[in-house]
Every structure is written in C-alpha cells, then in structure tokens.
C-alpha cells in the first residue's frame, strides 16, 4: 500500500487522524519539506533576538541580534557583543589588534597600517590600534630648498613612535 503521506507538500502535515489527509500547518508552525507527519513550532525571536524573517507555513522564522550585538551560529542561536574599535573578532571572542594593525570599526578584522614609504611619503601621524597612520609629504618635500631631482629619503617604519 502506497504511503499517502509522501504526497503532502511543504506547509502541510500528514494527518493520521483523518485518513492521511494533508492538513495545513496550524498557526505558528511550519513544515519545510513534504511528507511530514507533524509541523514544527515556529521559532520566536525575543529578548536579545529580533525578527529578521517572519515564520511562514513552509519556513521557520529567522532571528537577528539587537543593535550592538551580532549573531553566532548558522541560525543565530546566540548573540555576542560587538567588539570595540581597536579589536577584532576571533574564534575566542574580541582580541586587541596586534602592533602594526588597526580596526576603526566595531566589526571586521584588524588591517595593517598603511606603509607610507611605498608612496614615497613619510608618516605624519603614528598609527594606533584604532587608527591608521596618516601619511604626509615625502621627506624630500619637507627639506628646505630640496629640488624634485633629489631622491626621497627612506621613510621610517610606519606607525613606530619613539619609546
């Protein structure tokens, strides 16, 4: 005897109480695949979780985290506080940027300071964990009476400040 349940599409369940008739999922429940004997309860996004996508008869609700937090896990099962500027998110959580790198945002990764010398410029303002270096004119441009024929002096390492 063929199992009539296999004909029940997503958004329905196979109702054994009614001779295996396909019944629509009740409110606040869903079935994302066909042939299911029960519908799953919709996820509720509450507390630190906010709704990104409402539940439908064929798909679960999707949650996001409230402002200042970001999701962990494929289905946003946990919320983690955004990192501070000068940090990056690692597998173990927020970690300070290593020397020579910076992050001016609360998300993303630490990026290397700009190497001013590659553009023939010098460091005007040293870099920090939160800010990139600021490059200024080349050292040659700064020396009085320097001609444009003068080769640029080697710039010191970007971001290094005297200890």
């Amino acid at each position: 005897l063929q199992d009539l349940c296999s004909n029940c599409p997503a958004g329905t369940f196979c109702d054994n109480n009614r001779s295996q008739i396909c019944s629509p999922c009740p409110p606040n429940s869903f079935s994302s695949a066909g042939g299911q004997r029960t519908c799953d309860i919709c996820r509720q996004c509450k507390g630190v979780f906010k709704t990104r996508k409402e539940c439908s008869s064929t798909s679960n609700a999707e949650c996001d985290c409230i402002s200042g937090y970001h999701c962990l896990g494929a289905e946003c099962s946990m919320c983690e506080q955004d990192c501070k500027q000068g940090q990056e998110l690692t597998k173990k959580g927020c970690k300070d940027c290593c020397f020579g790198t910076f992050n001016d945002q609360k998300r993303g990764i630490c990026r290397p300071w700009t190497n001013c010398s590659l553009d023939g410029k010098s460091v005007l303002v040293n870099g920090t964990k939160e800010r990139d270096v600021v490059c200024g004119p080349s050292p040659a441009d700064l020396s009085p009476g320097a001609s444009s024929a003068t080769p640029p002096a080697p710039a010191r390492e970007p971001g290094h400040s005297p200890q």
């Epitope: 509450k46 896990g73 099962s77």
Partner: antibody, heavy 116, light 107 residues
Framework: QVQLVQSGAEVKKPGASVKVSCKAS????????MHWVRQAPGQGLEWMGA????????DYNQKFKDRVTMTRDTSISTAYMELSRLRSDDTAVYYC?????????WGQGTLVTVSS | DIQMTQSPSSLSASVGDRVTITCRAS??????LNWYQQKPGGAVKLLIY???RLHSGVPSRFSGSGSGTDYTLTISSLQPEDFATYFC?????????FGGGTKVEIR
C-alpha cells in the same frame, strides 16, 4: 556595570508561596530575556523558565509549569519569580540570569528554605 | 529534553596541572554549549559560550572545544582560584539543561 541584585533569603512553610525579585541595572532591561535557575543543596543547576520583559511572554520548564509564575515590572527594571504550593524539596538557592543564548550575568542567588 | 552528562563528577589536582572536563549531550547541540564556574560561596560566572568563545575577563588558560554531542573544557595550568565547580549547559533547545557539575578539588 551590568548587575542583577536579588531579594533576601526566605523561610516558608510547606504549602505557602514565595516571590523572589531580581533588579537589573547597567543595561536596557527590556532588551534581554531573564531566566530563573535553581540549585538544591549539594545538587546541580536546574532551569525553571524565562520571561521576555518586553512582552511579558514566558517559557516554563514543564516540571514547574503549574506552580511557577514569572512576571516583571519594567518601570523598576525588576523581574519576579513566584513559586506556589511549596514543598520541602523546593529548598534551594534561586538565581536570575540575563540571556544572550548563554547566561552572561547572574544574580547573587536567593536562598529559600521550606520547613515546617 | 536534552540530557547533559558531565564527567568526571569530581577530580583532585595540583596547582599547575592541566585539567580536562567533558560534557556529552544526548543529541547534537550544534556548538550551543556554555561553561560556568561556581565558587563555594555560590556565585555563578560564565566562562565560555558557544563552545569556545572566552567571556570577557576570563583568563586565557581556560579553553573550550567540541562539536556535535561531545564537548571539553580545559584549564591549561590550574591556579589556586580555579578550585571550584564547573557546569556545562546547552542552549540548543528549551528546556535549557545543565550537566551535573564537576568539582575540582586541591590534591
């Protein structure tokens, strides 16, 4: 800083009710679910349920469903857990905890002793 | 309900020892596993969440790993302040459930 401060210890007779409070400070109270966990003497931790302060919606552990009531007063950033028809095996420390999918901040605990 | 089985229930160790505590779930909890520390006074603190993420202020000697049903808390070099009871807890499904706890005592 984020803090949860609970009400003081209680001694109750069997059959009575107890209401424990948990006052939140240092964050937006309505933005995070508050959970309640208890620990009987020498035992492990047992989840009792949770309340969404924004809506007042609750989720209870089936074990306590007919005896527990969780409420909140958003005007004073306080959550409450009331347990009725107390028995001697309800003697425990009751904790509130803020939820992010994990309990990042816990109250100091409230000892409830049920004794005749 | 998801059952959480923690082992050992107690252990004796010395300062400087490497300590490993395991937690097994009765079904796949997809890394939704947290670890807590409880000192004798009763205060409970979050150590690790989402299997391996260190809560702010927790020393780096604590680490977590695992997937599926099997998870581990490791203390790389036990310090005097680490003598306490440790609990795992799953956040995969309601009701949230905890392991039975592991008491770490001084040898």
């Amino acid at each position: 800083q984020v803090q949860l401060v609970q009400s003081g210890a209680e001694v109750k007779k069997p059959g009575a009710s107890v209401k424990v409070s948990c006052k939140a400070s240092g964050y937006t109270f309505a933005g995070f679910e508050m959970h309640w966990v208890r620990q009987a003497p020498g035992q492990g931790l047992e989840w009792m349920g949770a309340i969404d302060p924004k809506t007042g919606g609750t989720d209870y552990n089936q074990k306590f469903k007919d005896r527990v009531t969780m409420t909140r007063d958003t005007s004073i950033s306080t959550a409450y857990m009331e347990l009725s028809r107390l028995r001697s095996d309800d003697t425990a420390v009751y904790y509130c905890a803020r939820d992010l999918g994990y309990f990042d901040v816990w109250g100091q605990g409230t000892l409830v002793t049920v004794s005749s | 309900d998801i059952q959480m089985t923690q082992s050992p229930s107690s252990l004796s160790a010395s300062v400087g020892d490497r300590v490993t505590i395991t937690c097994r779930a009765s079904q796949d909890i997809r890394s939704n596993l947290n670890w807590y520390q409880q000192k004798p006074g009763g205060a409970v603190k979050l150590l690790i969440y989402y299997t391996s993420r260190l809560h702010s202020g927790v020393p780096s000697r604590f680490s977590g790993s695992g997937s599926g049903t099997d998870y581990t808390l490791t203390i790389s070099s036990l310090q005097p302040e680490d003598f306490a009871t440790y609990f795992c807890q799953q956040s995969e499904k309601l009701p949230r459930t905890f392991g039975g706890g592991t008491k770490v005592e001084i040898r």
